[in-house]
Interface confidence: medium
């Protein structure tokens, strides 16, 4: 191009349909210059115009020759340019923000603009750049890109941004620009100009000075607070911690808290101080609701479902910010809500849901929600399998008869379609408790009844009951305990009876033992004793309890004595015992020794003994008739251990074994014995009957049985030289080689001559008795032999 010709041809487009080409005028040309622009394409197109720019339709791919003639006063000049799409710049129109608004409560800016896509026929990607500036000094705080697509029509776009600083703290500006990315355009793509700026500012009210107010925030987050004030702010505190001030426009200041800690239930105070005032807010730092743990739905009564759960991690948010729960049942669409004022730790929460007619399967979703988020748990339950019955109430016991009672109780709920398994605990005093399980049909009216048999008459029982459904989910709690005394029944057995002839042989003394409670079947009031022979039956007057003995004057004929126990209901079967005693001539008295607590007695089997055996025992020192106690054992027995709390060691007892045949008793064995032998309690009394020059004759007496304390097994006789009241050693002191000992094992021996002694010498004599229980104390004497003649 010649100097002075049009130069610097530049073409731009904003829509790919029209190119706006402009050039620089030749130097020295004035205002009245005309231009002829010719475009060499299939047909040459020329345009006359008076300005240095022209809008032409977009040229298809390829090179085009553009001729520009400038026609002016002092002649003309021509420039030729080669134009290709690659030399064209795509610069979108400057966008315009339609609307900028703010939600001050969430510190969110909302931006709205039109992409003017109708002027751009080709589908293209658009990149928008959005710039947020803060404060009057327009500090950049956010620059983001936002991608959209042009689709041939005007489209509204929205963008929002949550500010880290409350919007009340400072003025915020927003501007946008765009960049069109078209795959088919080979020219240069450039950003549009920035849109005219829009701003948002807070119109202060006289009340609130600190922002945000009462904000709920996730623990660990960062947050900015500010104070909007006409006064100079001196300091800022969060809790008790000072924070550095960030200066904003005017006197406004901000503080930034990083990684905020969990708040107390009353929140955390944020305080700004000026010379004259204190301004503040409260922040609530907590957690979103945890997933409800162990959600469990069950029913007590098949009328109402109780869903309980553990809230999990504590949110630290209470009151209006606490977690609210909604239990939704998806099959029915029904729901119930729980709004808690507080969130206690580790406490199980629960909601009640009314059961629906003819619905057994429930699909529950428990939604938890607080200002920081939401969570949920689900459970699918067949409610007929999840019955946790109420505690049985109105538990009553009524008599049916002496061995059976009727238990009744109340179990609220409509259980018509369900069976119960109930466990009855039966406790007798001083006895092991028994458990009985019963299956009963559920009813609508909540009243249940069951009969309990196989009980003992006149027995104090304690009953309680608990129930579960037969499929078992949970046992109910135990009912209250109910004590009940079963009614009396006739005594089931006659008393255990024995008889003894009085010492003069004229009277028969009948003894009997009180019936055990399980045989008495009631309170025994009296006993009837009768006596019958072939000729007659003679009844004694009624003997009131607790007398357990009667005396009848009888001759030596054979009588059958009958003892009957009576209670308020009736009489026991009679206990019969014969008065006759079958003689036994070849009886020896045997010795027996026990085992500390009792005594084992054994005997040979005797087929003639058809009724039973009786072992009776008494204290040997007691007068006749000798009876302390007796025990009956079956006729097939050959041994028994006799034990009694009254047995004492060292006491001699007489034991008698009787066998019964043809209703008469025969004494089979007579024994004396000790439960445990002890050493004698005294020494034998002895005297010197005769002395000579070389011998001494000693004589001693029997030790009384009570003081012997065992069977006498012998005597120990010690002798040696020794004088009374001298320092010479006594006979029993150790280390004496001249002491002689005689062990006398013939217990019938009562004298002893000691020979080969020295004349006119003092001898110390000692005598001791011994049993298998030990050696008794000593008796000593000093004797001087006669002089040799």
């Amino acid at each position: 191009q010649k100097k002075g010709a049009p130069h610097d041809l530049k073409c731009v487009t904003n829509n790919l349909q029209v190119w706006n080409c402009s050039w620089k005028a030749p130097s020295g040309t004035g205002r009245g210059t005309d231009y002829e622009v010719c475009i060499e394409n299939r047909s040459r197109s020329c345009y006359q115009l008076e300005k240095t720019s022209i809008k032409i339709p977009a040229l298809s791919h390829g090179d085009y020759e553009i001729t520009i003639n400038s026609l002016h006063d002092f002649g003309s000049s021509t420039s030729k340019f080669t134009l290709n799409e690659q030399n064209v710049s795509l610069i979108p129109d400057t966008p315009e923000i339609l609307n900028l608004s703010a939600d001050f409560s969430t510190s969110t800016l909302y931006l709205k603009w039109n992409d003017r896509g109708s002027v751009f026929p080709h589908r293209s990607n658009v990149i928008w750049e959005i710039k947020v500036l803060r404060k009057e000094s327009m500090e950049l705080v956010k620059l983001v890109t936002h991608n959209t697509t042009l689709n041939g029509k005007d489209t509204l776009h929205h963008w929002s941004w949550a500010s880290d600083m409350p919007l009340e703290c400072a003025i915020h500006f927003v501007e946008i620009r765009c960049y069109i990315d078209n795959l088919h355009f080979s020219g240069l793509e450039e950003w549009s100009d920035w849109s005219p700026v829009k701003n948002i500012s807070w119109i202060p009210d006289s009340q609130t000075k600190v922002f945000p107010q009462d904000k709920v925030i996730l623990v660990g987050s960062d947050i900015t607070f500010c104070c909007v004030s006409q006064e100079k702010v001196l300091s800022a505190l969060i809790g008790h911690t000072n924070c550095p001030l960030i200066h904003l426009d005017g006197e406004n200041v901000a503080i930034k808290i990083r990684n905020i800690s969990v708040s107390a239930s009353s929140g955390t105070n944020v305080v700004f101080t000026t010379e004259d005032n204190i301004f503040g807010t409260v922040i609530f730092a907590g957690y979103p609701p945890d997933t409800p743990q162990q959600l469990n739905c069950e029913t007590h009564d098949l009328k109402e479902i109780i869903c309980s759960w553990n809230p999990g991690r504590v949110t630290a948010l209470v009151g209006p910010r606490a977690t609210s729960y909604t239990l939704v049942e998806s099959f029915s669409g029904k729901y119930v809500r729980l709004k808690r004022a507080e969130a206690p730790t580790n406490e199980s929460y629960q909601l009640l849901f009314q059961m629906l007619p003819n619905q057994e399967i429930y699909n529950f979703t428990l939604n938890a929600h607080n200002p920081l988020g939401r969570s949920q748990s689900t459970i699918l339950v067949n409610i007929t399998e999840k019955v946790y019955p109420h505690t049985p109430t109105s538990f009553k016991v009524k008599d049916i008869n002496s061995t059976a009672v009727k238990l009744s109780w109340h179990l609220p709920g409509n259980f018509a379609k369900i069976n119960f398994l109930c466990e009855i605990e039966i406790k007798k005093s001083n006895s092991v408790q028994e458990q009985r399980n019963v299956t009963i049909k559920g009813v609508e009216n909540s009243s249940y009844l069951v009969a309990l048999d196989k009980l003992n008459p006149y027995t104090l029982y304690t009953f309680r009951i608990r129930c579960s459904t037969e499929t078992f989910w949970k046992w109910s709690k135990w009912s209250n305990k109910k004590q009940h005394l079963t009614t009396e029944a006739s005594p089931s057995k006659g008393p255990d009876t024995w008889r003894e002839w009085s010492s003069d042989g004229k009277n028969l003394i009948i003894y009997w033992k009180p019936l055990p409670i399980n045989e008495a079947n009631g309170k025994i009031l009296s006993y009837n004793v009768s006596c019958s022979s072939d000729e007659e039956t003679q009844s004694l007057s009624e003997i009131p309890d607790p007398q357990h003995k009667a005396e009848i004057r009888l001759d030596k004929n054979d009588y059958i004595i009958s003892v009957v126990a009576k209670n308020s209901v009736g009489s026991s079967p009679p206990s019969k015992i014969a008065s006759m005693e079958i003689p036994n001539d070849d009886l020896k008295i045997e010795q027996v020794v026990g085992m500390g607590k009792g005594i084992l007695l054994t005997w040979h089997y005797d087929p003639n003994m058809t009724c039973d055996y009786v072992i009776k025992w008494c204290n040997s020192s007691r007068s006749e008739p000798c009876l302390m106690d007796w025990r009956k054992v079956p006729s097939n027995s050959t041994e028994t251990v006799i034990e009694s709390d009254e047995f004492r060691p060292g006491i001699r007892y007489n034991f008698f074994l009787y066998g019964c045949r043809n209703q008469g008793y025969q004494l089979l064995r007579s024994m004396i014995g000790y439960i445990e032998e002890l050493a004698p309690i005294v020494a034998p009394n002895f005297t010197v009957e005769d002395t000579s020059a070389d011998s001494i004759l000693v004589k001693w007496e029997d030790i009384p049985v009570e003081e012997l304390r065992g069977f006498l097994r012998g005597y120990l006789f010690y002798f040696g030289k020794g004088e009374r009241d001298t320092s010479k050693m006594r006979v029993l002191e150790s280390g004496r080689s001249d002491i002689k000992v005689k062990n006398i094992t013939d217990i019938s021996q009562k004298t002893l001559r000691i020979a080969d002694l020295q004349g006119k010498t003092s001898y110390h004599l000692v005598l001791r008795a011994y049993t298998d229980g030990g050696v008794g104390p000593e008796k000593s004497m000093y004797v001087v032999t006669k002089e040799n003649s």
Partner: antibody, heavy 116, light 110 residues
Framework: QVQLVESGGGVVQPGRSLRLSCVAS????????MNWVRQAPGKGLDWVTV????????YYADSVKGRFTISRDNSKNTLYLQMNSLRAEDTAMYYC?????????WGQGTLVTVSS | DIQMTQSPSTLSASVGDRVTITCRAS??????LAWYQQKPGKAPKLLIY???SLESGVPSRFSGSGSGTEFSFTISSLQPDDFATYYC????????????FGGGTKVEIK
């Protein structure tokens, strides 16, 4: 999605021990009772043990009582079966299954082979 | 223990047939019975619970009936996908024997 995945099976000698795990996902594990059911090769289903949603009740088949222990960790959504003193007759595919009684969701199973 | 006896152990049938399986309990279990389907190499799948209630998502051609000790399971019109083994299971009691399954019925193509 809602599923149960068992693991821990393998070949073990008689008298030795093995621990099976079952990881639950897609549902609130802590709200459901869980079972182990086994199936010997070519045989029918054989219930082994159950544990309540909160671990409060556990029941066992007589054949495993005293040898197997069921447990759960609700925080890990995991069910366990500790198998001690294993016998040849314990050889089976072991399934974990959801529910106290009606077993409405089953895992794919893990094979336990007890052999010397 | 509650024993569950299932019959027959094998059943041959054709597509479209009506098929019935029975299950007998050794003592009354009320309606506490479930039916499962198991295909080779797969885990069992619950079809029926409480003797006659159809599990969600199970086709209505499957049905169950009975109470006490006698139960039956019916497929009204056998489909190709129904050839499998079917098990009954009582869930009345965990004690003493726990949940118990029947021995299974294999439904095979005739």
């Amino acid at each position: 999605q809602v599923q149960l995945v068992e693991s821990g099976g393998g070949v073990v000698q008689p008298g030795r021990s093995l621990r099976l795990s079952c990881v639950a996902s897609g549902f609130t594990f802590s709200s459901y009772g869980m079972n182990w059911v086994r199936q010997a090769p070519g045989k029918g289903l054989d219930w082994v043990t159950v544990i309540w949603f909160d671990g409060s009740n556990k029941y066992y088949a007589d054949s495993v009582k005293g040898r197997f222990t069921i447990s759960r960790d609700n925080s890990k959504n995991t069910l366990y079966l500790q198998m001690n003193s294993l016998r040849a007759e314990d050889t089976a595919m072991y399934y974990c299954a959801r529910g106290e009684r009606t077993l409405d969701l089953w895992g794919q199973g893990t094979l336990v082979t007890v052999s010397s | 223990d509650i024993q569950m006896t299932q019959s027959p152990s094998t059943l041959s049938a054709s597509v479209g047939d009506r098929v019935t399986i029975t299950c007998r309990a050794s003592q009354s279990i009320s309606s506490w019975l479930a039916w499962y389907q198991q295909k080779p190499g797969k885990a069992p799948k619950l079809l029926i619970y409480k003797a006659s209630s159809l599990e969600s998502g199970v086709p209505s051609r499957f049905s169950g009936s009975g109470s006490g000790t006698e139960f039956s399971f019916t497929i009204s019109s056998l489909q190709p996908d129904d050839f499998a083994t079917y098990y009954c299971q009582q869930y009345k009691s965990f004690s003493p024997g726990g949940l118990t399954f029947g021995g299974g019925t294999k439904v095979e193509i005739k």
